[in-house]
């Protein structure tokens, strides 16, 4: 189910690359979030807590990624007109229950500005 | 037709304990989480314990945790909660729902059943 | 612990009013809210999930709306069979139903 289009900007480009943001609530404690282009899974990213609160992060698809409380960054670099697809955050939460999973996503555009050296 | 039915039901002295069933039907139960919610007598809705599809995962509410246990049997599509150390606050009616399936795509609690009465007095 | 508020309580309307019902959440609960009906010795029925998705089978004069901490039910012309009380549940940490809105006769 498509939940819809993420309601922030969620592609920042750098330097012939693009950092994708895939936001989740701060209250979330244990998730999984995908990014899918179109319907491939590029990149995945799961946060689950241990005994004694120890934080564990795994990578099934492993993308440069980066992680804050409250959202995943994916990095896609040497961008070229390939690129140019829908992506999605596909996000899956653990604890705090209840199970559920949400998609949100966008269009990303290529133009000739963004595959070198420009900085954004 | 889906639908979830109670029993277990009735009048119990405090401290003591009673034993909830919900049988499931119409639907593939061990593709489901299941929760148990109550109501007192004119009051609102109050969540009490969660169970994922598998059993894997159990929550409980801070009121009834250490008290109250929630188990299922996917193979007799049957919810549980087994209560114990029962108090006058417990009174309610109890349901048991039908929560999200495991894909996470369902809605929550689509499907409740009938409720079952319980009073804790002396 | 999110806290849901529900206003009003009580709600005396007539059959083919336009009736909204209001709950606010104590933080940000992005669109995990759903919407029950419950009339009196029944369990309670989802009308809407998500915020603003209408349950299978429910009226059409039914809708949601609202993310962040403000949401809205809207009974676009209420019928005698909508007569009842009406809960909002978050669902994004565990769940807190809001206390209720009764809807009755004017």
């Known amino acids: 189910e498509i939940n819809g289009s993420a309601n922030y900007e969620m592609f920042i480009f750098h330097n012939g690359g693009v950092q994708i943001l895939c936001k989740y609530p701060d209250i979330v404690q244990q998730f999984k979030m995908q990014l899918l282009k179109g319907g491939q899974i590029l990149c995945d990213l799961t946060k689950t807590k241990g005994s004694g609160n120890t934080v564990s992060i795994k990578s099934l698809k492993f993308c440069h990624s980066q992680l804050s409380n409250n959202s995943v960054s994916f990095f896609l670099y040497n961008l070229d007109h390939s690129h140019a697809n829908y992506y999605f955050c596909n996000l899956s939460i653990f604890d705090p229950p209840p199970f559920k999973v949400t998609l949100t996503g966008g269009y990303l555009h290529i133009y000739e500005s963004q595959l070198c050296c420009q900085l954004k | 037709q889906v639908q979830l039915v109670e029993s277990g039901g009735g009048l119990v002295k405090p401290g003591g304990s009673l034993r909830l069933s919900c049988e499931a039907s119409g639907f593939t139960f061990s593709d489901y989480y299941m929760s148990w919610i109550r109501q007192a007598p004119g009051k609102g809705l109050e969540w009490v314990s969660y169970i994922s599809s598998s059993g894997s995962a159990i929550y409980y509410a801070d009121s009834v945790k250490g008290r109250f246990t929630i188990s299922r049997d996917n193979a007799k599509n049957s919810l549980y909660l087994q209560m114990n150390s029962l108090r006058v606050e417990d009174t309610a009616v109890y349901y048991c729902?039908?929560?999200?399936?495991?894909?996470?795509?369902?809605?929550?609690?689509?499907?409740w059943g009938q409720g079952t009465m319980v009073t804790v007095s002396s | 612990d999110i806290q849901m508020t529900q206003s009003p309580s009580t709600l005396s309307a007539s059959v083919g009013d336009r009736v909204t019902i209001t709950c606010r959440a104590s933080?940000?609960?992005?669109?995990?809210l759903a919407w029950y009906q419950q009339k009196p010795g029944k369990a309670p029925k989802l009308l809407i999930y998500?915020?603003?998705s209408l349950e299978s089978g429910v009226p059409s004069r039914f809708s949601g709306s609202g993310s962040g901490t403000e949401f809205t039910l809207t009974i676009s012309s209420l019928q005698p069979d909508d007569f009842a009380t009406y809960y909002c549940q978050q669902y994004l940490s565990y769940w807190t139903f809001g206390q209720g809105t009764k809807v009755e006769i004017k």
């Open positions: 998500k915020a603003s």
């Open positions: 729902a039908r929560d999200e399936d495991y894909h996470g795509s369902g809605s929550p609690r689509d499907i």
């Open positions: 933080q940000s609960i992005s669109s995990w």
